[in-house]
Amino acid sequence: MVPPPENVRMNSVNFKNILQWESPAFAKGNLTFTAQYLSYRIFQDKCMNTTLTECDFSSLSKYGDHTLRVRAEFADEHSDWVNITFCPVDDTIIGPPGMQVEVLADSLHMRFLAPKIENEYETWTMKNVYNSWTYNVQYWKNGTDEKFQITPQYDFEVLRNLEPWTTYCVQVRGFLPDRNKAGEWSEPVCEQTTHDETVPS
């Protein structure tokens, strides 16, 4: 009897949906795998007789529940199917946004770029899928533990009146208030402010 694939899970980030699994121990030889998805009550092959332990389901509709299954095969034998249900719009992980930071005197000017979606138009981003899309920004003085959070209203934000000649670090994530679903933080960007622009009287 052929054992089923183990640890079957969907690794989905920004709607790049990769079904992954692990090959079970099997003494007779190398296993192959077939992965399918349910479409109009019929299972359709997505990856057939593959030696890989993953299958790309990024073409699935973003909405609704999808039933996926995978089994192991050897010669004319096969394992039972292992099923999971996956809802991309709920289950996908929101990857880190892009961020551009520019120093102007004692201010940091930031522009945010929503993560792009795989297999879509070049301009299509996570912001197009989620109506409530917003950003969380956190910043701190480099070398200190205290972090400050703000929620910009737009795709840009300015941190003003910062201490001159001080290095500040900033990171951003996507956030969906209606779902309380937070994305992954971007890597911190650290920049040093310059002089205070205020003119002495």
Partner: nanobody
Framework: QVQLQESGGGSVQTGGSLRLSCAAS??????VGWFRQAPGKAREGVAT????????YYTDSVKGRFTISRDNAKNTVYLQMNSLNAEDTAMYYC??????????????????WGQGTQVTVSS
């Protein structure tokens, strides 16, 4: 900020059942896990569930006995525990937002934690 509150713990005889609940203070469409910690032992993963509830993972010792589920309309995740035995005695915690590795049952991947509910199984 997500706040989690566990309930449903208590004392039960060997072979008995309990249903734990984990209520989020606001809607939380992220992965959720149940973990437990017995006195003098490390915190270990028990079960996790995906945001939509369509995928679940269990540690080997509870497979076939415990069932994790969620009701997103009620912002609540449940752990139904059957055929309990003395080894299940522990403080049970729920945790939310397991990131990319939520299915691995590792405490360090989860961002938000409840205060815990005690489960005691006696013969």
């Amino acid at each position: 900020q997500v706040q989690l509150q566990e309930s449903g713990g208590g004392s039960v005889q060997t072979g008995g059942s309990l249903r734990l609940s984990c209520a989020a203070s606001q809607v939380n469409m992220n992965s959720v896990g149940w973990f437990r910690q017995a006195p003098g032992k490390a915190r270990e993963g028990v079960a996790t569930i995906s945001p939509s509830g369509g995928a679940t993972y269990y540690t080997d010792s509870v497979k076939g006995r415990f069932t994790i589920s969620r009701d997103n309309a009620k912002n609540t995740v449940y752990l139904q525990m059957n055929s309990l035995n003395a080894e299940d005695t522990a403080m049970y915690y729920c945790a939310a937002d397991g990131g990319r590795d939520w299915w691995l049952l590792r405490p360090q991947t989860f961002s938000y934690w409840g205060q815990g509910t005690q489960v005691t199984v006696s013969s």
